[in-house]
Amino acid sequence: EINGSANYEMFIFHNGGVQILCKYPDIVQQFKMQLLKGGQILCDLTKTKGSGNTVSIKSLKFCHSQLSNNSVSFFLYNLDHSHANYYFCNLSIFDPPPFKVTLTGGYLHIYESQLCCQLK
């Protein structure tokens, strides 16, 4: 419901790739996090809890991802100029109720020094 620019470092570059950091409040137990490029869903990750507090992680649009207790990182590799765009983290909260959606994002600038395979 609260939409805006990420007020943290959302993009972390390394080895010709980028880690896109999508945060969520640590009170949140069950959620879906989608990574959007423009309006297109690139990746998603859903965390649910079953009986006995068993945690289930599912992805419909799979990307290499990493989950912590307050963030989901999505990794994009082999960067080129076509990756430059607005990226958004779309968080849907299921638990605690009630259902909430919040969107935050930023622009990914691609500089020559960050490209995967530069011509020498």
Epitope: E1, I2, K23, Y24, P25, D95, P96, P97, P98, T104
Partner: antibody
Framework: EVQLVESGGGLVQPGGSLRLSCAAS????????MHWVRQATGKGLEWVSA???????YYPGSVKGRFTISRENAKNSLYLQMNSLRAGDTAVYYC???????????????????WGQGTTVTVSS | EIVLTQSPGTLSLSPGERATLSCRAS???????LAWYQQKPGQAPGLLIY???SRATGIPDRFSGSGSGTDFTLTISRLEPEDFAVYYC??????????FGQGTKLEIK
């Protein structure tokens, strides 16, 4: 002035139905989650139902399947449809605003910050 | 399911005295998600404290909240005649989404 005004209470026989309404004013109704909370005479507060800004609904076991909460944002109105009423449902019913704000980094809960004056429901033969 | 138990059920004090009301949860809850309400006879409840310790708008500073985990306290440092009422604690969570303690009645001795 921020205000919630309930209506629709009255006397109904066991097994009967009643629809409560709550008119909201003085704030952007569609931006807030809303609750119904009831209180039997001389007793404590009991949460009855909640509806999120997306229209998602929540109930405790005591009313699930019998009560239905709904909202009409265009009319700044909250409703509670009560079916299969029992004597134990007799109470004052309050319409309540829930104040919370969620960002990607924080989940702020500011409590139930606005209450209506209540409407009385009596279930008796 | 989280159950909130308030004590004492009734507290008899005189104006000017200090009141200490307790709210105990059956399992850990985050202090950010605990609130206190005051209800005077014939009136709707009103929000006093949210986030366990933050006063709601317009609430005098003689009211304070504290606690974490399973034990929470509402303190009224110096009772005024208008403070004699029933006080409820409330939590929000997953199951149930919302629950109240049974209340503490603060009466004039």
């Amino acid at each position: 002035e921020v205000q919630l005004v309930e209506s629709g209470g009255g006397l109904v026989q066991p097994g009967g139905s009643l629809r409560l309404s709550c008119a909201a004013s003085g704030f952007t109704f569609s931006s807030y989650d809303m609750h119904w909370v009831r209180q039997a005479t001389g007793k404590g507060l009991e949460w009855v139902s909640a509806i999120g800004t997306a229209g998602d609904t929540y109930y405790p076991g005591s009313v699930k399947g019998r009560f239905t909460i709904s909202r009409e944002n265009a009319k700044n109105s909250l409703y509670l449809q009560m079916n299969s009423l029992r004597a134990g449902d007799t109470a004052v019913y309050y319409c309540v605003r829930d104040n919370r704000k969620v960002t990607h980094e924080h989940y702020y809960y500011y409590g139930m910050d606005v209450w209506g004056q209540g409407t009385t429901v009596t279930v008796s033969s | 399911e989280i159950v909130l138990t308030q004590s004492p059920g009734t507290l008899s004090l005189s104006p000017g005295e200090r009141a200490t009301l307790s709210c105990r949860a059956s399992q850990n809850i985050r202090s950010s998600y605990l609130a206190w309400y005051q209800q005077k006879p014939g009136q709707a409840p009103g929000l006093l404290i949210y986030g366990a310790s933050s006063r709601a708008t317009g609430i005098p500073d003689r009211f304070s909240g504290s606690g974490s985990g399973t034990d929470f306290t509402l303190t009224i440092s110096r009772l005024e005649p208008e403070d004699f009422a029933v006080y409820y604690c409330q939590q929000f969570g997953s199951s149930p989404m919302c629950s109240f303690g049974q209340g503490t009645k603060l009466e004039i001795k």
